[in-house]
C-alpha cells in the first residue's frame, strides 16, 4: 500500500525532518508550510491550522522560502555614483553597483555599499595594476626609458621614442623629442591603454588628492548572518 501523504500541519516521525518547503514549528510541534519568495507569514501555524502567508508590501522582499513575520526592507536607492543592476521586487533586493570609472570600496552581501573613483596616475606614473570592480588602480613611477604624460586610470608607461638625434631627452613624464622628422623607431601614435574593467568604461579627469603612488586601500568587512528563519533550512 502506498504511504499516506501528510498534509501540513503534521507531526513528523521521530527522528525525521520536515519536507522541502516546510519547517518544524517548535510551539505547535508540527511540520508547517513555509511561505514562498515574495511572501511572509501572516498567521503562524497551530496544531490544526497551517501557516497563512501574505504578499510583501512595496519596497520589501523575501528571496527564499521562509516563515518570517515581516519581509525584509529593500536597500535604499542607488547613489549618484552607482547604477541599479537589479530592481527591488517582492522577491529580490535592489542591487547597486559602481558606475564606470568607479570601484567598490565597501561591498555588501550583494552589490556595493560605497563606491570610490578610480585613482588616476598623474604624469610620470603609469598603471601598474588596473582597477577592477572591487579594487583601485595601482600606479607606479615610470622606469627610465619610459614615460606617461597623461592623468589617467588606464594608461601605462610607454617607451620613449628612439631618435637618430635627440633634441630634448625624454623623462618620466615626457617623450623624447627628436631633431629629425623621422625617428628610427617610435611607438604607434596615441596612448597605450590597458584593458578596462567592466565598471570603468569612461574616463574622468579629476585628480586624486593622495599621491599617485599611494597603495590601494582594501576594506574587509565580515558578512552579516542571513536573516533569521528566512531559508534557514534551505528550500
Amino acid at each position: 500500500l502506498p504511504a499516506q501523504v501528510a498534509f501540513t500541519p503534521y507531526a513528523p516521525e521521530p527522528g525525521s525532518t520536515c519536507r522541502l518547503r516546510e519547517y518544524y514549528d517548535q510551539t505547535a510541534q508540527m511540520c508547517c508550510s513555509k511561505c514562498s519568495p515574495g511572501q511572509h507569514a501572516k498567521v503562524f501555524c497551530t496544531k490544526t491550522s497551517d501557516t497563512v502567508c501574505d504578499s510583501c508590501e512595496d519596497s520589501t522582499y523575501t528571496q527564499l522560502w521562509n516563515w518570517v513575520p515581516e519581509c525584509l526592507s529593500c536597500g535604499s536607492r542607488c547613489s549618484s555614483d552607482q547604477v541599479e543592476t537589479q530592481a527591488c521586487t517582492r522577491e529580490q533586493n535592489r542591487i547597486c553597483t559602481c558606475r564606470p570609472g568607479w570601484y567598490c570600496a565597501l561591498s555588501k552581501q550583494e552589490g556595493c555599499r560605497l563606491c570610490a573613483p578610480l585613482r588616476k596616475c598623474r604624469p610620470g606614473f603609469g598603471v601598474a595594476r588596473p582597477g577592477t570592480e572591487t579594487s583601485d588602480v595601482v600606479c607606479k613611477p615610470c622606469a627610465p626609458g619610459t614615460f606617461s604624460n597623461t592623468t589617467s586610470s588606464t594608461d601605462i608607461c610607454r617607451p620613449h621614442q628612439i631618435c637618430n638625434v635627440v633634441a630634448i631627452p625624454g623623462n618620466a613624464s615626457m617623450d623624447a623629442v627628436c631633431t629629425s622628422t623621422s625617428p628610427t623607431r617610435s611607438m604607434a601614435p596615441g596612448a597605450v591603454h590597458l584593458p578596462q574593467p567592466v565598471s570603468t568604461r569612461s574616463q574622468h579627469t579629476q585628480p586624486t588628492p593622495e599621491p599617485s603612488t599611494a597603495p590601494s586601500t582594501s576594506f574587509l568587512l565580515p558578512m552579516g548572518p542571513s536573516p533569521p528563519a528566512e531559508g534557514s533550512t534551505g528550500d
Epitope: Q26, T27, K42, V43, K47, V52, P228, A229
Partner: antibody, heavy 119, light 106 residues
Framework: QVTLKESGPGILQPSQTLSLTCSFS??????????VGWIRQPSGKGLEWLTH???????YYNPALKSRLTISRDTSENLVFLKIANVDTADTATYYC???????????WGQGTTLTVSS | DIQMTQSPSSLSASLGGKVTITCKTS??????IAWYQHKPGKGPRLLIH???TLQPGIPSRFSGSGSGRDYSFSISDLEPEDIATYYC????????FGGGTKLEIK
C-alpha cells in the same frame, strides 16, 4: 477598541479549584488568527505565561503547569475561562488575560485580577 | 523550555538619558522577541515585537536589536512616564518572559 477584563474569586483556600473568567470586546474569537491567553504575576515577581486558546480551539499550556490547567471559551459571549486545580499559596498572584494575534504576540491585556490563596 | 535571562534587574537613570536592557536566551530564538512596559495596576503594554519593530503609536525613543541568543532594548531621551518595569518575551518556542527590569529616574 479592544478591551479585556478578568474576574475571579479574590481569595481561595489551598486545594480548591480556581475559576477565572476573561470577558473581552472589540474582537471575536471566531476571527481567524486570534486567541486569548492567561499570564500571571506572583507578588514581587515576574510574568509567567500559563495557557492560551486559539480561534480554532487549539490550546497551548505551560508544560510545568499543564496537569492543573484547563482553558475553554464561549465564543458567542466573548468569554474565555481558566481553571487551575488544587491551588496552593504559590498560586497567589495577579492573573491577566490577553489577546494573542496570529504572529503569537500578546498585543492587548486586561488590568488583572488578584488571587490570594490562604488557609 | 527556553530560559530567559534579563539584566539588570533594576536601574536608575537621569531624565533625558539613555538606558539599555538585555535579554539572553538559552537557545537561538530567530528574533522572535517582544518587549513590554508594565506599570502598577495596569496590564503590560506591547512596545516592540520581532526584535526591533515598533508597535503603532510607540515613540521612536524605544528601540530593540539583536539576533541569535542575545537581544537588547533601549530607551533614549528618558521621560518621567518611562518609569515602569520592562519585560522581554520570547515566542519562538511556546512563551517565556524575562525576569523584568525596574526602571527608576534619578
Amino acid at each position: 477598541q479592544v478591551t479585556l477584563k478578568e474576574s475571579g474569586p479574590g481569595i481561595l483556600q489551598p486545594s480548591q479549584t480556581l475559576s477565572l473568567t476573561c470577558s473581552f470586546s472589540g474582537f471575536s474569537l471566531n476571527t481567524f488568527g486570534l486567541g486569548v491567553g492567561w499570564i500571571r504575576q506572583p507578588s514581587g515577581k515576574g510574568l509567567e505565561w500559563l495557557t492560551h486558546i486559539w480561534w480554532n480551539d487549539d490550546k497551548y499550556y505551560n508544560p510545568a503547569l499543564k496537569s492543573r490547567l484547563t482553558i475553554s471559551r464561549d465564543t458567542s459571549e466573548n468569554l474565555v475561562f481558566l481553571k487551575i486545580a488544587n491551588v496552593d499559596t504559590a498560586d497567589t498572584a495577579t492573573y491577566y488575560c490577553a489577546r494573542i494575534e496570529g504572529l503569537r504576540r500578546f498585543d492587548y491585556w486586561g488590568q488583572g485580577t488578584t488571587l490570594t490563596v490562604s488557609s | 523550555d527556553i530560559q530567559m535571562t534579563q539584566s539588570p534587574s533594576s536601574l536608575s537613570a537621569s531624565l533625558g538619558g539613555k538606558v539599555t536592557i538585555t535579554c539572553k536566551t538559552s537557545q537561538d530564538i530567530n528574533k522572535f522577541i517582544a518587549w513590554y512596559q508594565h506599570k502598577p495596576g495596569k496590564g503590560p503594554r506591547l512596545l516592540i515585537h520581532y526584535t526591533s519593530t515598533l508597535q503603532p503609536g510607540i515613540p521612536s525613543r524605544f528601540s530593540g536589536s539583536g539576533s541569535g541568543r542575545d537581544y537588547s532594548f533601549s530607551i533614549s531621551d528618558l521621560e518621567p512616564e518611562d518609569i515602569a518595569t520592562y519585560y522581554c518575551l520570547q515566542y519562538a518556542n511556546l512563551w517565556a518572559f524575562g525576569g523584568g527590569t525596574k526602571l527608576e529616574i534619578k
